[in-house]
């Protein structure tokens, strides 16, 4: 008796964080023996979609011509070979941006900061939200997020950084979201350029943490359970 079929690989192009209205293609790659590919979406009762394999049969394409709220969510895929169905793929978390109006991102006291000093990035939304995300472009792990306790709605989130080093310099954006769907984000804020001057090449810092803050160094992003999917955002913004 052969062991279980190897699980397929699932990914999205151009990425798994997609702006409203844009197209995205989900790919599922199995083996050359695949007869059929099936894509399941969490909380969808029937198989979400099914497709013949593309030659040479080791993968299938699931096209989404225009991203909407309905497509945001968690997917897995399977393939069927002559001996049966494979194990499920690792999940793909498809996130849609543009669900809410863009927040405003600012730096206090200023986006020009001297190395060794403190700065707080402030993400503010017009309507109350319960999750705020801070993205740093071209960082290895750009996602930092703050989620208000007990689902309390608030208009802003603070991301303190102290002490600041040259590592903190760069371009940031933030998003806001409602906790009822971790897969729907606001439009991105306008970019904020954080400029660090007078660099003292000190060791990588640990940011200040308070009860209301979840922010970590770039190689140790904090991702509390139930947060906005990490993998999707990281893949998109790297």
């Amino acid at each position: 008796q052969a062991g279980p079929l190897p699980k397929p690989t699932l990914w999205a192009e151009p990425g798994s964080v997609i702006s409203w209205g844009n197209s995205v293609t989900i790919w599922c790659q199995g083996t050359l023996e695949a007869r059929e590919y099936r894509l399941d979406k969490e909380e969808s009762p029937a198989p979400w979609d099914r497709q013949n394999p593309l030659e040479p049969k080791n993968k299938a394409r699931f096209s989404i011509p225009s991203m909407t709220e309905d497509y945001a969510g968690r997917y897995r895929c399977y393939y069927r070979s002559p001996v049966g169905w494979s194990q499920p793929s690792d999940p793909l978390e498809l996130v849609m941006t543009g669900a809410y109006s863009k927040p405003t991102l600012s730096a206090l006291p200023s986006p020009l900061v001297t190395s060794g000093k403190s700065v707080t990035l402030l993400c503010q939304s017009r309507s109350p939200m319960d999750t705020f995300l801070l993205i740093k472009e071209r960082a290895a792990h750009p996602l930092l997020h703050l989620r208000s306790e007990h689902g309390a709605q608030q208009h802003q989130a603070e991301f303190p950084m102290s002490p600041v080093t040259s590592v903190h310099g760069g371009t940031y954006r933030c998003f806001s979201s409602h906790g009822f769907s971790h897969y729907l984000l606001s439009h991105p804020s306008d970019p904020l350029e954080l400029i660090v001057s007078g660099s003292l090449e000190d060791p990588r810092p640990s940011p200040t943490r308070s009860v209301s803050t979840a922010a970590g160094p770039e190689d140790q992003p904090l991702m509390p359970t139930g947060s906005v999917p990490h993998s999707g955002l990281r893949r998109h913004w790297e």
């Epitope: 009762p45 029937a46 198989p47 979400w48 979609d49 013949n52 309905d70």
Partner: antibody, heavy 120, light 107 residues
């Protein structure tokens, strides 16, 4: 019990379109794909396509891809098949059939059929 | 597309006879083979799915077997109510395709 009830017979002119409905009851409509199959007089069965009622995803027989459109109305548990640019060869009985998604990919319950006659 | 070829295209048998219909696929369909019964003026009814599994409510005189490209449908003891046309259908790949049908009549 599972029931698929289709709309009544239609007579259409060549070049026109027809829209056939299939109202489902006795099961959760969004939990099963729906197929459409046709049968010309005295002929065999020909698969047109399938639709997932929960999200509107479709797969078509290439032969019908440019002319057939499958849709659903979840609020009324109804599936629709529209065929455009009708020609005399489209004269047939059109069936909806529920997918039994497990081994076999079979069609386990069928509507009673809708006769579409294309004649000038 | 996978072509499904049924044989014979028609057959005549007596009540109580054992009746066999075969279906050949143009490529391996991995047991994703289903059989339907259609009576005149009626919609098809599923009898057997996945080569040999009986659909609910279907009498046990109906059975199926086969693998790869060759499949067989059998009625162990023909009854008058079995007069119909029988179709095989592959569910292995899209598009789904049917055999051309076998018309069964009583001698």
């Amino acid at each position: 019990q599972v029931q698929l009830v289709q709309s009544g017979a239609e007579v259409k002119k060549p070049g026109a379109s027809v829209k056939v409905s299939c109202k489902a009851s006795g099961y959760t409509f969004t939990s099963y794909w729906m197929h459409w199959v046709r049968q010309a007089p005295g002929q065999g069965l020909e698969w047109i396509g399938e639709i997932n009622p929960s999200n509107g995803r479709t797969n078509y027989n290439e032969k019908f891809k440019s002319r057939a459109t499958l849709t659903v109305d979840k609020s009324t548990s109804t599936a629709y098949m529209e065929l455009s640019s009708l020609r005399s060869e489209d004269t047939a009985v059109y069936y909806c059939a529920r997918d039994r998604y497990d081994e076999g990919n079979a069609m386990d319950y069928w509507g009673q059929g809708t006769t579409v006659t294309v004649s000038s | 597309d996978i072509q499904m070829t049924q044989s014979p295209s028609s057959l005549s048998a007596s009540v109580g006879d054992r009746v066999t219909i075969t279906c050949r696929a143009s490529q391996d369909i991995t047991n994703y083979l289903n059989w339907y019964q259609q009576k005149p003026g009626k919609a098809p009814k599923l009898l057997i799915y996945y080569t040999s599994r009986l659909h609910s409510g279907v009498p046990s005189r109906f059975s199926g077997s086969g693998s790869g490209t060759d499949y067989t449908f059998t009625i162990s003891s023909l009854q008058p109510e079995d007069i119909a046309t029988y179709y095989c259908q592959q569910g292995d790949t899209l598009p789904r395709t049917f055999g051309q049908g076998t018309r069964l009549e009583i001698k």
